[in-house]
């Protein structure tokens, strides 16, 4: 889906004027942006020698990190470049400017509606984690209709910047644990679950920790059934696969539907050299088709002794009387030699990639 870039994400190679001394500037950049921090001399007087520091450690200039007396540039920024930056007088170590920089996915995912605390105070002083917006964490019980999007937030800070992890009912919680997957927005200290279903009910705990301590907060989610609803497929399944000629492959598709879904495995085919019919509908052949009586179905497609003919685009499709959910995926089939060559080519390619 196209979500668009949110205005608060600072544009590529945008220069940001420095704050008044003693103030902390909170800045958000998009992944891949050029971070430019500017620290003019206080009162316009002479600057003297300066050093740029990130999270208490002096920055070493490199091809990507360009250090000047009044300006710092970090090219092709990534999440690792988030942190507390300061420009200091070399001799006195007096802080002339300091910035809290957070590098987020860009364009923004669109699920961070409020956004004001996207760049939290990471704190210049060393210290254990603490909540930066405790007033936003008062609502411990969340009851939402099924099919809605739920977002739990635990905005925190500390130095070094703490890590955040999530538990469901006291156990580690990962994307593969739920139909529809999850989105972890570490920069927003949030857990996002789209299209929630009754099985998402439970206690969700955020654990925020660094080497100086750990804090946690538990939310309870109740899902009010919005039924019937169209089928939901688990995010990331089925996954694309590459197989060697003659091998066996297996694809998984997890379907959630409270109304008996018709589940199909389909393969795109060509008819008379065309992939689509006169009306523009793709030609497909049905490989497997059945009706599931269970609310959650973990369905598999197994292809034995694959040949080059098996390569191509496939679909897992679930249909009930409300609507359809489908996921396309690819199978690439190579001879053993071709597979080896592909590994060599990938190795030689180094950092070159296709978008």
């Amino acid at each position: 889906e196209s979500l668009g870039t949110e205005q608060r994400v600072v544009g590529r190679a945008a220069e940001v004027p420095g704050p008044e001394p003693g103030q902390q500037e909170q800045l958000v950049f998009g992944s891949g942006d050029a971070v430019e921090l500017s620290c003019p001399p206080p009162g316009g007087g002479p600057m003297g020698p300066t050093v740029w520091v990130k999270d208490g450690t002096g920055l070493v200039p490199s091809e990507r990190v360009l250090v000047g007396p009044q300006r710092l540039q970090v090219l092709n920024a990534s999440h690792e470049d988030s942190g507390a930056y300061s420009c200091r007088q070399r001799l006195t170590q007096r802080v002339l400017c300091h910035f809290s920089v957070r590098v987020t996915d860009a364009p923004s995912s669109g699920d961070d509606e409020d956004g004001e605390d996207e760049a939290e105070d990471t704190g210049v002083d060393t210290g254990a984690p603490y909540w930066t917006r405790p007033e936003r964490m008062d609502k411990k019980l969340l009851a939402v209709p099924a099919a809605n999007t739920v977002r739990f937030r635990c905005p925190a800070a500390g130095n070094p910047t703490p890590s955040i992890s999530w538990l469901k009912n006291g156990r580690e919680f990962r994307g593969e644990h739920r139909i529809g997957g999850i989105k972890l927005r570490h920069q927003q200290w949030s857990l996002v679950m789209e299209s929630v279903v009754p099985s998402d009910r439970g206690n969700y705990t955020c654990v925020v920790e660094n080497k100086f301590g750990s804090i946690r907060q538990t939310y309870t989610l109740d899902v009010l059934e919005r039924s019937p609803h169209r089928p939901i497929l688990q995010a990331g399944l089925p996954a694309n696969q590459t197989a060697v000629l003659g091998s066996d492959v297996e694809f998984h598709c997890k379907v959630y539907s409270d109304a008996q879904p018709h589940i199909q495995w389909l393969k795109h085919v060509e008819v008379n050299g065309s992939k689509v019919g006169p009306d523009g509908t793709p030609y497909v052949t049905v490989l497997k088709s059945w009706i599931s009586e269970s609310v959650e179905a973990d369905v598999r497609l197994r292809l034995a002794n694959v040949s080059e003919r098996d390569g191509g685009e496939y679909l897992c499709r679930a249909t009930n009387f409300i609507g359809v959910a489908e996921k396309a995926f690819w199978l690439s089939v190579h001879g053993p030699r071709a597979a080896e060559e592909e590994l060599v080519e990938a190795d030689e390619a180094g950092s070159v990639y296709a978008g």
Epitope: P228, T281, F321
Partner: antibody, heavy 115, light 108 residues
Amino acid sequence: QVQLQESGPGLVKPSETLSLTCTVSGDSINSYFWSWIRQLPGKELEWIGHIYSSGSTRYNPSLQSRVTISIDTSKNQFSLKLSSVTAADTAVYYCARGASAVDYWGQGTLVTVSS
Amino acid sequence: EIVLTQSPGTLSLSPGERATLSCRTSQSISSGYLAWYQQKPGQAPRLLIYGASRRATGIPDRFSGSGSGTDFTLTISRLEPEDFVVYYCQQYGSSPYTFGQGTKLEIK
């Protein structure tokens, strides 16, 4: 909350074509089935047909030769055309979400076939 | 096409009583593809039950559906004054999807 609203003329002359449009609000029309159902004066409910957001359709065989259902995803609308109408087509016409069983209905619009 | 026969045509009961509405199909319905709707005067029908026994959102638990094959039942455990309206069953397992003629629930 999904809402559906039928619109179109309430009076159609015999042998002409009945045309109704349903506007969907509160959700995208994509990935769902959308149906037309009518309720005849004797209160009998009759399924007319449905359309999927891709444009694929299924019609009641008893009406198939006269029915066309189309969809405009950019406007979040779908439409019904019923040709060569007679007095027997006088009914309250409902648009609804779902292919067969339906969970959301419009409030219905009465279409009278009369000269 | 599959014909649905609802019985009785009219059912007279008092508030607080239990109502049992029947729907019989001319052919077996695959996978319990049967729905029940409630229709109040001047309103569109409202989905109560789908899949023969699954309650739709917001439907009070006094409504329950059961049955399989050709015999299906809608049960209202304790009748409230607002329940005295018309009920339709519908099969959606085989096109054309067809409705019963309705059962009118009236206050005795």
